[in-house]
């Protein structure tokens, strides 16, 4: 017996109520591939979600987050509250980055400043809660008569604290 369902295009479903005849997906549902036996319910972008792309008979709706939130997870499955630069989101809300750490985005965690000395360099611009340090030339490069050739970077030693 031929599988008549394989003839049903995207946007339809193979209607077992009537001998595998193709029927259009009902409103607010979709089938993104041919040969489907059911249509999937369209995603609804409610609450902290807003619609980026409307659902059609062949593709699901796509959501974004409303202002003050950002997407997390595949296909924006969650919305997480934004914080200010220089902050990170904790269970108790947005908290300033601890000294020696920074966050230059509205999302994510505070990260340690770069340890310039690990690369044999010196701190050119100090770090803040919002910005990483800027590393400059090594102290040796700044001394009079120093060779223009860059010396090899010293081996990394554990335990160096941020500059």
């Amino acid at each position: 017996l031929q599988d008549l369902c394989s003839n049903c295009p995207a946007g339809t479903f193979c209607d077992n109520n009537r001998s595998q005849i193709c029927s259009p997906c009902p409103p607010n549902s979709f089938s993104s591939a041919g040969g489907q036996r059911t249509c999937d319910i369209c995603r609804q972008c409610k609450g902290v979600f807003k619609t980026r792309k409307e659902c059609s008979s062949t593709s699901n709706a796509e959501c974004d987050c409303i202002s003050g939130y950002h997407c997390l997870g595949a296909e924006c499955s969650m919305c997480e509250q934004d914080c200010k630069q220089g902050q990170e989101l904790t269970k108790k809300g947005c908290k300033d980055c601890c000294f020696g750490t920074f966050n230059d985005q509205k999302r994510g965690i505070c990260r340690p400043w770069t340890n310039c000395s690990l690369d044999g360099k010196s701190v050119l611009v100090n770090g803040t809660k919002e910005r990483d340090v800027v590393c400059g030339p090594s102290p040796a490069d700044l001394s009079p008569g120093a060779s223009s050739a860059t010396p090899p970077a010293p081996a990394r030693e554990p335990g160096h604290s941020p500059q």
């Epitope: 003839n7 049903c8 295009p9 995207a10 946007g11 339809t12 109520n17 009537r18 001998s19 005849i21 193709c22 029927s23 259009p24 997906c25 009902p26 409103p27 607010n28 549902s29 059609s56 008979s57």
Partner: antibody, heavy 123, light 108 residues
């Protein structure tokens, strides 16, 4: 609300191809099947076939060898071509929205029809 | 294909009378996919009943449908002058969709 309007030549010569277009207004052609039905003078209704917005078709076996349907979603139109016509193809030709389900899977029949266009096959 | 047979071919009645139209399918049809249409001369068919018994939008309550399996009935409880027309049953349970040959309701 959705409205349908058939258009095309009212007179076609025998052995030639009948071509009709149905224009959908007041709604989108997308997400539905669309049917063609004809009615010879003084006779009953005959279903010719249907087309989905992707171009997928089902034809009445009695006409299948002569029928071609197509769809132009950009113009909100679908079309019927019937080749090698004879006097027996003289009829009023109607386009209609084919049956569909609502969100609760209640099924609706052919609920919207065009007013019909008369096609006469004669030399 | 499913053959739909309507009876009688013609029904001669006076306004105010009850009209009972029959439709028989050559094989069982799920009632969800049985429709009735009204056609006034010179006009396109109009959907009256879908799902064998549900009135379409704007259809007066004097029209009712019933039946299941192979036997279906359209009833007009009290004929109005505008009801004299041809009535067709139609199935879209199995391809190809098919119509009955029609019942003409005429003024006696």
């Amino acid at each position: 609300q959705v409205q349908l309007q058939e258009s095309g030549p009212g007179l076609v010569k025998p052995s030639e191809t009948l071509s009709l277009t149905c224009t959908v207004s007041g709604g989108s052609i997308s997400s539905y099947y669309w049917s063609w039905i004809r009615q010879p003078p003084g006779k009953g209704l005959e279903w010719i076939g249907r087309i989905y917005t992707s171009g997928s078709t089902n034809y009445n076996p009695s006409l299948k060898s002569r029928v071609t349907m197509s769809v132009d979603t950009s113009k909100n139109q679908f079309s019927l071509k019937l080749s090698s016509v004879t006097a027996a193809d003289t009829a009023v030709y109607y386009c209609a929205r084919d049956g569909w389900y609502d969100e609760d899977y209640n099924y609706y029949g052919m609920d919207v029809w065009g007013q019909g266009t008369t096609v006469t096959v004669s030399s | 294909e499913i053959v739909m047979t309507q009876s009688p071919a013609t029904l001669s009645l006076t306004p105010g009378e009850r009209a009972t139209l029959s439709c028989r399918a050559s094989q069982s049809v799920s009632s969800n996919y049985l429709s009735w249409f009204q056609q006034i001369p010179g006009q396109a068919p109009r959907l009256l009943i879908y799902g064998a018994s549900t009135r379409a939008t704007g259809i007066p309550a004097r029209f009712s449908g019933s039946g299941s399996g192979t036997d279906f009935t359209l009833t007009i409880s009290s004929l109005q002058p505008e009801d004299f027309a041809v009535y067709y049953c139609q199935q879209d349970y199995d391809l190809p969709w098919t119509f009955g040959q029609g019942t003409k309701v005429e003024i006696k």
